[in-house]
């Protein structure tokens, strides 16, 4: 029970086109040290959506202040959703490594479906 778990409470979320999608993710421990990343899809072809450590992700904002001490909330919001954003999103914890961080554990995934914009 002490080993870190990655919790994505929502199996699915529905969002209207043009709105923001909020995807929740929480860790049960601060250990091991290392960044979290969000991906759409799984396997070799997965698409990086957000990297806590580096990069520029203009449509993504974090719900909590990720630099806050003892933060366990890694939820994100993706703005201006379009049908092309549909898919399953995974919150993934990495363990700090040298030279590269190593994937440690993934959440179960949250499927994002996009509704037509209300008329």
């Amino acid at each position: 029970e002490d080993e870190l778990q990655v919790i994505q409470p929502e199996k699915s979320v529905s969002v209207a086109a043009g709105e923001s999608a909020t995807l929740r993710c929480a860790m049960t421990s601060l250990i091991p040290v290392g960044p979290i990343m969000w991906f759409r899809g799984a396997g070799a072809g997965r698409e990086l959506i957000y990297n806590q450590k580096e990069g520029h992700f203009p449509r993504v904002t974090t719900v909590s202040e990720l630099t806050k001490r003892n933060n366990l909330d890694f939820s994100i919001s993706i703005s201006n959703i379009t049908p092309a954003d549909a898919g399953t999103y995974y919150c993934v914890k990495f363990r700090k490594g040298s030279p590269d961080d190593v994937e440690f554990k993934s959440g179960a995934g949250t499927e994002l479906s996009v509704r037509a914009k209300p008329s």
Epitope: I7, P9, S12, V13, S20, T22, A26, T28
Partner: antibody
Amino acid sequence: QLQLQESGPGLVKPSETLSLTCTVSGGSISSNSYYWGWIRQPPGKGLEWIGSIYYSGSTYYNPSLKSRVTISVDTSKNQFSLKLSSVTAADTAVYYCAREVGAPPSYPFDIWGQGTMVTVSS
Amino acid sequence: DIQMTQSPSSLSASVGDRVTITCRASQSISSYLNWYQQKPGKAPKLLIYAASSLQSGVPSRFSGSGSGTDFTLTISSLQPEDFATYYCQQAYSHPFTFGGGTKVEIK
């Protein structure tokens, strides 16, 4: 302090759509710290989570009801609403709206409305 | 779906008694477990969140423990206002689910 108040018809005919609104007072529904949920309780029975919404419009539904449920939010009125279509007698229940803490740990429902009884009958 | 099983479904106790209610999840839910109290005709009230954290304003005679699949709500010294139905709820994975409830009655 923050309060929630459900409103809507207490009697709905079978096959029609149940519509309820929850009005939030004493605080903003647009806080990024909270989600807003609907829970129901049939007479003499336990609690069932129906679904939740975030102020930005993201919705989360119980798969057992997903095909019949729509939850929406109106931030300008500080309200969120529930629609449940094609109702039957099994949908007779007290319907509660509640505030769900959006951050870990454990996402509890910390503030509840007083509940409104909805009876499905012809 | 994660099933939540509470026991006992009802119990009789006297004022001053120590009361223990258990809740078991069908799979590990870490500490994502909440406890509520409900009195007849009223909405549920949050007592304990995250398995063991006391909600603000709740008397300290209420306590929670457990992690993983097995959880306990304890009332250290039952008071007249504690006669009610108690529900556990998991918030680990949608759909969030509640236990069937434990009714605490006067002996």
